[in-house]
Interface confidence: low
């Protein structure tokens, strides 16, 4: 899916508003710098590819995000201000349903919400896409985003 | 205990518009998206649009789009569904519903209970 | 956009039989909701993503079905199930089915 036509103001708001802070609730009890940012993003739309995959792809390790309340609220969002993503999603949800069949916290899902969390920051602090670029504008960036 | 009520009956005039309201209580209203959805007499539902109360972030069904309006007051935890250019056709009970995100699909899981709306001349 | 078919358009039954009801989508979609409706009053929601009961609905109602064919099943009619029965899909905005009506035989 390419999130470049993206309501990216709304999905922002729908972040600061209650995905952040459900993030952080699944996150409680493990200090801020228990994990290293290996995961990072250019701009908008990339940050939104990053942040689908990490969320709803099941990985070894951790196959039960996409049942988490950050998740589902992250899933809304994109439904609702992404054109046409609910329909890219079919299959991946049919396949995330086979995968969940328990809500494990296993510390492998502790490093990825991590990871997210700083997807997150970045989408909603997009400056520098690379060096010597100048600060980040939405117009701008419909030319640098990545297809995946 | 999750309530949606609306508003009264409305008897409109063609070209005229309408204002339902639906006041939400027992959750924090801008926390949960809110559908509005028609049925018109003997019809099936009819999904018109969806609200993100926290923002104002809207969707709309195409066929509705342009003159249906969806707003909300947060500090009243009310959504409103505007309806202009009203016809025969427009005669319809309207329901709120609100989204929750429990269940995969975000199902409507509160509705209110609904406000019927006659447009005749 | 998504066109659900129910079928049958009616059905006609008598207490403590078993109703089968079709939700037919014109294309794929991930899950299904059901609702019931009786007159006057608003839709209530029965299954959640095809095959969750609702909170307070009986275990004589299930769902099942995937890609474009999904099924509600009441295993013993009682007379307070008599009524309009709607799908609705999610996948693509929100679209729901013409109803199906079980009445009394």
């Known amino acids: 899916y390419d999130f470049t036509n993206c309501d990216f103001e709304k999905i922002k708001a729908a972040y600061l508003s209650t995905i952040s802070k459900d993030l952080i609730t699944y996150m409680s009890g493990t200090k801020s710098t228990e994990f290293n940012n290996t995961v990072s993003c250019s701009n908008r739309p990339h940050c939104l590819t990053e942040i689908q995959s990490l969320t709803f792809n099941p990985t070894a390790g951790c196959a039960s995000l996409a049942k988490e309340m950050f998740a589902m609220k992250t899933k809304a969002a994109l439904a609702i201000w992404c054109p046409g993503y609910s329909e890219t999603q079919i299959n991946a949800t049919q396949a995330m349903k086979k995968a969940r069949k328990s809500k494990v916290t296993t510390n492998k899902c502790l490093e990825q919400v991590s990871q997210l969390q700083g997807l997150w920051r970045r989408f909603n602090r997009p400056l520098l896409k690379q060096q010597g670029s100048s600060d980040y504008k939405d117009d701008d960036d419909k030319h640098h985003h990545h297809h995946h | 205990e999750v309530q949606l009520v609306q508003s009264g009956a409305e008897v409109k005039k063609p070209g005229a518009s309408v204002k339902v309201s639906c006041k939400a209580s027992g959750y924090t209203f801008t926390d949960d998206y809110m559908n509005w959805v028609k049925q018109a007499p003997g019809q099936r539902l009819e999904w018109i649009g969806i609200i993100s109360p926290y923002n104002g972030g809207t969707s709309y069904n195409q066929k509705f789009k342009g003159r249906a309006t969806l707003t909300v007051d947060k500090s009243a935890s009310t959504a409103y569904m505007e309806l202009s250019s009203l016809r025969s056709e427009d005669t319809a009970v309207y329901y709120c519903?609100?989204?929750?995100?429990?269940?995969?699909?975000?199902?409507?899981?509160?509705w209110g209970q609904g406000t019927t709306v006659t447009v005749s001349s | 956009e998504i066109v659900l078919t129910q079928s049958p358009a009616t059905l006609s039954l008598s207490p403590g039989e078993r109703a089968t009801l079709s939700c037919r989508a014109s294309?794929?979609?991930?899950?299904m909701h059901w609702y019931q409706q009786k007159p006057g009053q608003a839709p209530r929601p029965l299954i959640y993503a095809t095959s969750n009961l609702a909170s307070g609905i009986p275990a004589r109602f299930s769902g099942s079905g995937s890609g474009t064919d999904y099924t509600l099943t009441i295993s013993r009619l009682e007379p307070e199930d008599f009524a309009v029965y709607y799908c609705q899909q999610w996948s693509s905005n929100r679209t729901f089915g013409g109803g199906t009506k079980v009445e009394i035989k």
């Open positions: 519903a609100r989204e929750d995100y429990d269940y995969d699909g975000y199902a409507m899981d509160h």
């Open positions: 294309s794929s979609v991930s899950y």
